[in-house]
């Protein structure tokens, strides 16, 4: 992989420890928490980033209505188990032996159970809806300009192939970005929509994961876009399995 040779850092992941101990003295970077080697030429998987975060010291124009099966990450942070490729393991458990099943973005998709809980496969999140509310601006945003700028951002900053940005909707002050990526569409080397969405989410919160970059400056024809709130909905290829008790709560 390519880490910055001169000062041996990982441009795409600040939560790494890098040293010139790779083959031929090349710079090699390992994720905090897991110690796994990461490819610094692309985004690091969300699972490894969450693990690193938990190990770090604590310091048409119409909007889309999320499907009834859409998941929102209400559980927040946890220390995940990642497989050897850095993906989330289908079953996650905490220190008190409470277990649950997650999707490919690490969001819980079943009720919590005990160690006997089975999660047969890692269900893929194939559709992500990012719902943003922007701050009032002095100048209005043109929909097509906004669309182009957000597509450019995902292509250039997050290295996500343009075909995976399905749509950008805008009804002031709400912006919705739809990312779609089926298992069959994702080729080797393609950035996962879940990873791109996570990097974007952290950028929007002012917690950039990129090494040495300032905060994300997103402008539409020079007019800065500032985000007041973010909601992210995750849709899985197989609908989640929650009890009726949770659904009516």
């Amino acid at each position: 992989h390519t880490a910055a040779q001169d000062n041996c850092t990982c441009p795409t992941n600040k939560m790494t420890v890098c040293s010139p101990d790779g083959p031929g003295g090349r710079c090699q970077c390992r994720a905090l928490g897991s110690g796994m080697a990461v490819d610094c030429s692309t985004l690091t998987s969300k699972c490894l980033l969450l693990k690193a975060r938990m190990s770090a010291p604590k310091n048409a124009r119409t909007l889309v209505r999320p499907s009834e099966h859409a998941l929102v990450d209400n559980d927040g942070l946890y220390d995940p188990d990642c497989d050897p490729e850095g993906r989330f393991k289908a079953r996650q458990c905490n220190q008190t032996s409470v277990c649950w099943c997650v999707n490919s973005v690490g969001v819980r998709r079943t009720d919590k159970g005990d160690l006997s809980l089975r999660c047969d496969e890692l269900v893929r999140t194939h559709h992500i809806l990012i719902d943003l509310r922007h701050r009032p601006t002095a100048g209005a945003f043109n929909h097509s300009d906004l669309d182009a700028e957000l597509r450019r951002l995902f292509r250039e900053r997050y290295r996500l192939h343009p075909k995976f940005v399905a749509a950008v909707h805008y009804e002031q002050p709400t912006i919705q970005i739809e990312l779609r990526q089926n298992t069959s569409q994702k080729a080797a080397g393609d950035v996962d929509i879940g990873d791109a969405a996570y990097y974007f989410e952290r950028d929007i919160k002012g917690e950039s994961l990129f090494q040495g970059r300032g905060g994300l400056d997103l402008r539409v024809r020079g007019e800065p876009l500032q985000v007041e709130r973010t909601l992210i909905y995750y849709l899985d290829e197989i609908p989640p399995k929650f009890s009726m008790k949770r659904l009516t709560a």
């Epitope: 701050r135 009032p136 002095a138 100048g139 950028d203 929007i204 919160k205 002012g206 300032g214 905060g215 994300l216 400056d217 997103l218 402008r219 024809r221 020079g222 007019e223 800065p224 876009l225 500032q226 985000v227």
Partner: antibody, heavy 122, light 106 residues
Framework: QVQLVQSGAEVKKPGASVKVSCKAS????????INWVRQRPGQGLEWMGW????????KYNEKFKGRVTMTVDTSTSTVYMELSSLRSEDTAVYYC???????????????WGQGTLVTVSS | EIVLTQSPATLSLSPGERATLSCSAS?????IYWYQRKPGQAPRLLIY???NLASGIPARFSGSGSGTDYTLTISSLEPEDFAVYYC?????????FGQGTKVEIK
């Protein structure tokens, strides 16, 4: 550190034009807009407009539209403000100031250039 | 255009005293920015997004407010704080500044 250095004082006759330059250093020039603000003697601050060097986008105060032109030279990290059809009431100190912003905050006008005194007199 | 009215026009205080400067907008704005200007110098940003201290600005400066009424407070005046203070809005074009409040030594 971030710095804006403006061109020197100018004396112009009514009806003439003036072009003030503002050279930026210490940051990625294309990453923030450059605003122009003037202060007439004994008066407050008056915003004239901004230009965004990355794509050349501009926003002018309607009061100066047709008389003000902002341009950018990315090769030298310099922004220019030209004011035409000068009259005596355009006598003022003209400042350039950069505005940094992220998706989290608008950081205001900071820093400012040292100012350029433009005197319009017959 | 949004008119910002600052009061008082002049504030006469002694070093060590508390200064409270007001900025009233003709229509609701989301955020206000405060600048300090000394004779012969360029303005300097003090507060951005209503209440955030700009880089290098001492903690004795603070900002607050919402809607149409905003305040800049200097908790204990230092000799170098005697200057003219301006508020500014970024809510709609044209961007506008208040006419300024002069803080002078009593």
């Amino acid at each position: 550190q971030v710095q804006l250095v403006q061109s020197g004082a100018e004396v112009k006759k009514p009806g003439a034009s003036v072009k003030v330059s503002c050279k930026a250093s210490g940051y990625t020039f294309t990453s923030s807009d450059i605003n122009w603000v003037r202060q007439r003697p004994g008066q407050g601050l008056e915003w004239m407009g901004w230009i965004y060097p990355r794509d050349g986008s501009k926003k002018y105060n309607e009061k100066f539209k047709g008389r003000v032109t902002m341009t950018v030279d990315t090769s030298t990290s310099t922004v220019y403000m030209e004011l035409s059809s000068l009259r005596s009431e355009d006598t003022a100190v003209y400042y350039c100031a950069t505005r940094f912003a992220t998706v989290v905050s608008n950081y205001g006008l900071d820093p400012w250039g040292q100012g350029t005194l433009v005197t319009v007199s017959s | 255009e949004i008119v910002l009215t600052q009061s008082p026009a002049t504030l006469s205080l002694s070093p060590g005293e508390r200064a409270t400067l007001s900025c009233s907008a003709s229509s609701s704005v989301n955020y206000i920015y405060w600048y300090q200007r000394k004779p012969g110098q360029a303005p300097r940003l003090l507060i951005y997004d209503t209440s955030n201290l700009a880089s290098g600005i001492p903690a004795r400066f603070s900002g607050s407010g919402s809607g149409t009424d905003y305040t800049l407070t200097i908790s204990s005046l230092e000799p170098e704080d005697f200057a003219v203070y301006y508020c500014q809005q970024w809510n709609s074009y044209p961007l506008t500044f208040g006419q300024g409040t002069k803080v002078e030594i009593k």
